[in-house]
């Protein structure tokens, strides 16, 4: 882009690509203006990441206007949640995480009535992703599936999400979990472990569907380091 991104000011509801270390520029929305009274977030916007429904505080230098940057950053990406994010920013830009409750004064998300509690195990958790982890560093970069052929095939296309499931650990189910989960969805609270354990993957599967009976193998990415905690809330989970 020709002009410097640093001077750009955003307002509530603006659509952007947000950059966090170790991650591609991610489709996002400005949800809250900087709150000068809060030192840690002064000059930082709270952004909502499409696809994963996580939030983080980012400065303007890490934000890029969506329409202007769409061609540059809007290319398909293997990261879990990225494809869903591209879809949501185009088709459902006002989407909110289930059970979302704003805890800050300058929120621009209209909340006429509280949304229903999060679906049990829906995984649309919100936390202050900036430098936080969920107490065991689970916000890690997901591993892209190996491409088996040129046309090919990242697994996990819709309609093929439950293929090849022997690797998948069975999540504990918590019939009572909905209310507890909804209570943890405040903007700045780190994810408590019991909620994390009971959650299913944080987003619907993305990527290409498998030619049947193809075995899934995954490569680790080089960037899977401590930077991972600064991710847009994308949980690494094994392929379903």
């Amino acid at each position: 882009m020709s002009r410097s991104n640093r001077q750009k000011e955003y307002k509530c509801g603006d659509l952007v690509f947000a950059k966090m270390k170790g991650y591609p520029h991610w489709p996002a929305r400005i949800d809250e203006m900087p709150e000068a009274a809060v030192k840690s977030t002064a000059n930082k916007y709270q952004v909502f990441f499409f696809g994963t429904h996580e939030t983080a505080f980012l400065g303007p230098k890490d934000l890029f206007p969506y329409e202007e940057s769409k061609e540059k950053f809007g290319k398909p990406n293997k990261r879990k949640g990225f494809s869903e994010g591209l879809w949501e920013i185009e088709n459902n830009p006002t989407v909110k995480a289930s059970g979302y409750q704003s805890s800050q004064k300058k929120s621009c998300v209209e909340e006429p009535e509280p949304e229903p509690e999060a679906a049990e195990g829906d995984g649309d958790k919100k936390g202050n992703a900036e430098g936080s982890s969920d107490e065991e560093g689970k916000l890690v970069i997901d591993e892209p599936a190996k491409e088996k052929n040129e046309k090919g095939a990242l697994k996990r296309r819709a309609g093929d999400l439950l293929e090849d499931s022997p690797k998948r650990p069975k999540e504990a189910e918590n019939p009572e979990g909905e209310e507890k989960e909804a209570a943890t969805l405040e903007v700045e609270r780190p994810l408590p472990m019991e909620v994390e354990k009971n959650s299913t993957p944080s987003e619907p599967g993305s990527g290409r569907g498998p030619p049947q009976e193809e075995e899934e193998e995954e490569d680790e990415e080089e960037e899977a380091t401590k930077e991972d905690a600064e991710a847009p809330g994308i949980r690494d989970h094994e392929s379903l």
Epitope: S83, R156, R157, S206, R208
Partner: antibody, heavy 120, light 106 residues
């Protein structure tokens, strides 16, 4: 704005082939991640998924109908096709096409449906 | 194949009621569940995707929840425009619809 419109022969004789056309606008079947699904609904009954054609031709069929169905597309004219190789009276139904993403977010936009009646 | 069962084929409710429609899968579908609304004129709309995410333009009185094999759609304040048949659909392994639940006004 995304729109889809189905068209077909209306009435067809048993054991004949049928070709249904879905003409759409607002998206392209050459775009990565895009698909068109075909769904039908016999009178007074529920929805039944038939087939999905993806942008890369890695298509999917309902196993119970697979031997009688074929999907294809004409990306330049924004059309998708459902071919039923030999129709039976049980194929009488309203046929819908719907836009789908491989991003697993459902059949996002649907056509209005076209009635196919199989009758001698 | 994954079977989807909507045990209630029809239900009557009054305007303003809170209505819950349930759906059960024959196996764990990991939240890969959508809800659709079909109006009497045949028009079909996606309401909720991935168990609980509201599709664009859908009123917030609609909500979805569930996990594993059991899912539900709730309409919190029934309006005349909600008269329709509601279908659940799994997309974990191919696509399968439930049999539908027809919602009528008392």
């Amino acid at each position: 704005q995304i729109t889809l419109k189905q068209s077909g022969p209306g009435i067809v004789q048993p054991s004949q082939p049928v070709r249904l056309t879905c003409t759409f606008s607002g998206f392209s079947l050459s775009t990565s991640g895009i698909g068109v699904a075909w769904i039908r609904q016999p009178s007074g009954k529920g929805l039944e998924w038939l087939a999905t054609i993806w942008w890369d031709d890695d298509n999917r069929y309902n196993p119970s109908l697979k031997s009688r169905l074929a999907v294809s597309k004409d990306t330049s004219n924004n059309q998708a096709f459902l071919n039923i190789i030999t129709v039976e009276t049980a194929d009488t139904a309203i046929y819908y096409c719907a836009q789908i993403y491989d991003y697993a977010v459902g059949f996002a936009y649907w056509g209005q449906g076209t009635l196919v009646t199989v009758s001698a | 194949d994954i079977q989807m069962t909507q045990t209630t084929s029809s239900l009557s409710a009054s305007l303003g009621d809170r209505v819950t429609i349930s759906c059960r899968a024959s196996q764990d579908i990991s939240n890969y569940l959508n809800w659709y609304q079909q109006k009497p004129d045949g028009t079909v709309k996606l309401l909720i995707y991935y168990t609980s995410r509201l599709h664009s333009g859908v009123p917030s009185r609609f909500s979805g929840s569930g996990s594993g094999t059991d899912y539900s759609l709730t309409i919190s304040n029934l309006e005349p425009d909600d008269i329709a048949t509601y279908y659940c659909q799994q997309y974990g392994k191919l696509w399968t619809f439930g049999g539908g639940t027809k919602l009528e006004i008392k």
